[in-house]
Interface confidence: medium
Amino acid sequence: VVSHFNDCPDSHTQFCFHGTCRFLVQEDKPACVCASGYVGARCEHADLLA
C-alpha cells in the first residue's frame, strides 16, 4: 500500500498552529490535520461551532 502522505519536513515543524502536519505526496504540499476545536489551512482559527 502506497501512503498518500508523509511526515512533514523539519522546515514545517511550526506549520500547523493547532494540529499535525502531513505532507501530501501527490500534490507536493503540506496540509494540517487539526486538533479538535480548530479549523483553517493551518488550524489557526478556533472553531466557534465545535
Partner: antibody, heavy 116, light 107 residues
C-alpha cells in the same frame, strides 16, 4: 487558473469600495482566495481571504472596514472596503493559495484612486 | 505583526553577476518565508517557497536559503529579464506580512 479583478477605478473619500475577482479554470470551492494590495511606493499589504468553505480571515488593521464574500454559482469572490480614504489608493490584486499562504496565481490587478 | 525588512532597497548590477538579496524578520518565522518577483507593470510571481523550495518553471539560477529570522535570495548569473522588485513574505504568523522590497536594476 485565471483570475481577473474588476472595480470602479475611482472613488471619493467615505465611499464604499466594491471589487470583484472572477476565477476561471478552477473552482473557488477549493483552496483559499485572497486580496492583496500594493500602495504607491511599492508596499504590499495582505488584506484577507475567503476559503473553500466560505470562512474568512481579515487583517486586523482592516477588520472594522473589510468584508470578503463569494458567489460560487458565478465562481467569483468580492472585496468590500468601507469608508475609504486617500490612504486606500492602491493596486488591488486577487490571488489564489492552496494553503492560505503561498500565493501562486494572481490577477493582473486593478487600480483604485481615492480622491475628492 | 511580524516586521519584514529587506536590504538593500536598490541593487544595480551588470548581467552575469551573482547577487544576494536579504530579508530579515522581527521574529523567528521557522522557514515559512516565500520570495516573489514583480516586474514593471507585471503581477507578482512566486519564485521560492518555504525559504528554499524551488517552484516549477522558475529558472534554477534563483535559489533561497536561511532560517530563523535571516533569509537570502540568490540569483546566479543575473540576466536582463531579472530586473524588477523582489519581495519576501512571511507565512508563519497571521497576518502575513511582506518586506518592503528590493529593486533590482540591470545596468
Amino acid at each position: 487558473v485565471q483570475l481577473q479583478e474588476s472595480g470602479p477605478g475611482l472613488a471619493k473619500p467615505s465611499q464604499t469600495l466594491s471589487l470583484t475577482c472572477s476565477v476561471t479554470g478552477y473552482s473557488i470551492t477549493s483552496d483559499y482566495w485572497n486580496w492583496i494590495r500594493k500602495f504607491p511606493g511599492n508596499k504590499l499589504e495582505y488584506m484577507g481571504y475567503i476559503s473553500y468553505s466560505g470562512s474568512t480571515y481579515y487583517n486586523p488593521s482592516l477588520k472594522s472596514r473589510i468584508s470578503i464574500t463569494r458567489d460560487t454559482s458565478k465562481n467569483q469572490y468580492y472585496l468590500q472596503l468601507n469608508s475609504v480614504t486617500t490612504e486606500d489608493t492602491a493596486t488591488y490584486y486577487c490571488a489564489r493559495s492552496y494553503d492560505g499562504i503561498c500565493f501562486d496565481n494572481w490577477g493582473q490587478g486593478t487600480t483604485l484612486t481615492v480622491s475628492s | 505583526d511580524i516586521l519584514m525588512t529587506q536590504s538593500p532597497a536598490t541593487l544595480s548590477v551588470t548581467p552575469g553577476e551573482t547577487v544576494s538579496l536579504s530579508c530579515r524578520a522581527s521574529q523567528n518565522t521557522y522557514k515559512n518565508l516565500h520570495w516573489y518577483q514583480q516586474k514593471s507593470h507585471g503581477t507578482p510571481k512566486l519564485l521560492i517557497k518555504y525559504a528554499s523550495a524551488p517552484i516549477s518553471g522558475i529558472p534554477s539560477r534563483f535559489t533561497g536559503s536561511g532560517s530563523g529570522t535571516d533569509y537570502t535570495l540568490s540569483i546566479n548569473s543575473v540576466k536582463p529579464e531579472d530586473e524588477g522588485i523582489y519581495y519576501c513574505l512571511q507565512g508563519y504568523s497571521m497576518p502575513w506580512t511582506f518586506g518592503g522590497g528590493t529593486k533590482l536594476e540591470i545596468k
